[in-house]
């Protein structure tokens, strides 16, 4: 007889026969025949398959290598891969998160606009007029200059984007 030319969803064509695909979490052991089912077996420990498939081998779970700054964010199952993220203070170098780099620090004159996460680096911004940062930091925002007036003091030294203003006592006018 002529073979089927197309099989249904979750089926595949082999030897002129439609066979059921193996469900996620299982691998193919043997193809079906007209009167036998597709034979599938569950993936082993530390293995997975995340789609309906006809794979004869399961994929290994991703290894989150601590030597690359990685740790497990979500443990893999027979149907899902392990998800890695970076240790505190580090972030992934790519979407696949195969390695990590240290969070960038914002230099003096720059403040943190957005603190880094496990997947994104620190975003820095220049301190605008009226603000300063005198440290290299991955957390510190730009600080506002001290208001000498509210302390009944006067500006003795103007602030910059890296230094605060220096306040001093007001000169007393002599009679």
């Amino acid at each position: 007889p002529e073979p089927p030319t197309a099989c249904r969803e979750k089926q595949y064509l082999i030897n002129s026969q439609c066979c059921s695909l193996c469900q996620p979490g299982q691998k193919l052991v043997s193809d079906c025949t007209e009167f036998t089912e597709t034979e599938c077996l569950p993936c082993g420990e530390s293995e997975f398959l995340d789609t309906w498939n006809r794979e004869t081998h399961c994929h290994q779970h991703k290894y989150c290598d601590p030597n690359l700054g990685l740790r497990v964010q979500q443990k893999g199952t027979s149907e899902t891969d392990t998800i890695c993220t970076c240790e505190e203070g580090w972030h992934c170098t790519s979407e696949a998160c195969e390695s990590c780099v240290l969070h960038r620090s914002c230099s003096p004159g720059f403040g943190v606009k957005q603190i880094a996460t496990g997947v994104s680096d620190t975003i820095c911004e220049p301190c605008p007029v009226g603000f300063f940062s005198n440290v290299s930091s991955a957390f510190e925002k730009c600080h506002p200059w001290t208001s000498c007036e509210t302390k009944d003091l006067v500006v003795q030294q103007a602030g910059t984007n890296k230094t605060d203003v220096v306040c001093g006592p007001q000169d007393r006018l002599r009679a």
Partner: nanobody
């Protein structure tokens, strides 16, 4: 896609014979594994017999072995069930079914296409 229409049912006396037909319209009848199922009043639908695409392999439920014969004529797009030595317990609606996926003969859920059924009543 195939449409199935059963015929040949009716009232027959115990020990009698009947031949059911299942006419398939649509293309590529010979790409389908075919089967007969039956459903007695108030019971589940049960497997009766199945036949391979080329007609060379057949399977039967134990309850009908030696009494029923399944056959097909691919040139006429027709499936048959020859029933003899009929018993009261053979009374049921008989359905023909078609599938393309490989599966054990009796797995009802594997069959993708079904006819409307034909009534067989065995009674004196």
């Amino acid at each position: 896609q195939v449409q199935l229409v059963e015929s040949g049912g009716g009232l027959v006396q115990p020990g009698g014979s009947l031949r059911l037909s299942c006419s398939a319209s649509g293309r590529a009848f010979n790409t389908y594994t075919m089967a007969w199922f039956r459903q007695a009043p108030g019971k589940e639908r049960d497997f009766v017999a199945a036949i391979s695409r080329d007609g060379t392999i057949t399977y039967y439920a134990d309850s009908v072995k030696g009494r029923f014969t399944i056959s097909r004529d691919n040139s006429k797009n027709t499936l048959y069930l020859q029933m003899s030595s009929l018993r009261a317990e053979d009374t049921a609606v008989y359905y023909c079914a078609a599938r393309r996926v490989g599966a054990v003969p009796e797995r009802e859920s594997a069959y993708e296409h079904w006819g409307q059924g034909t009534q067989v009543t065995v009674s004196s």
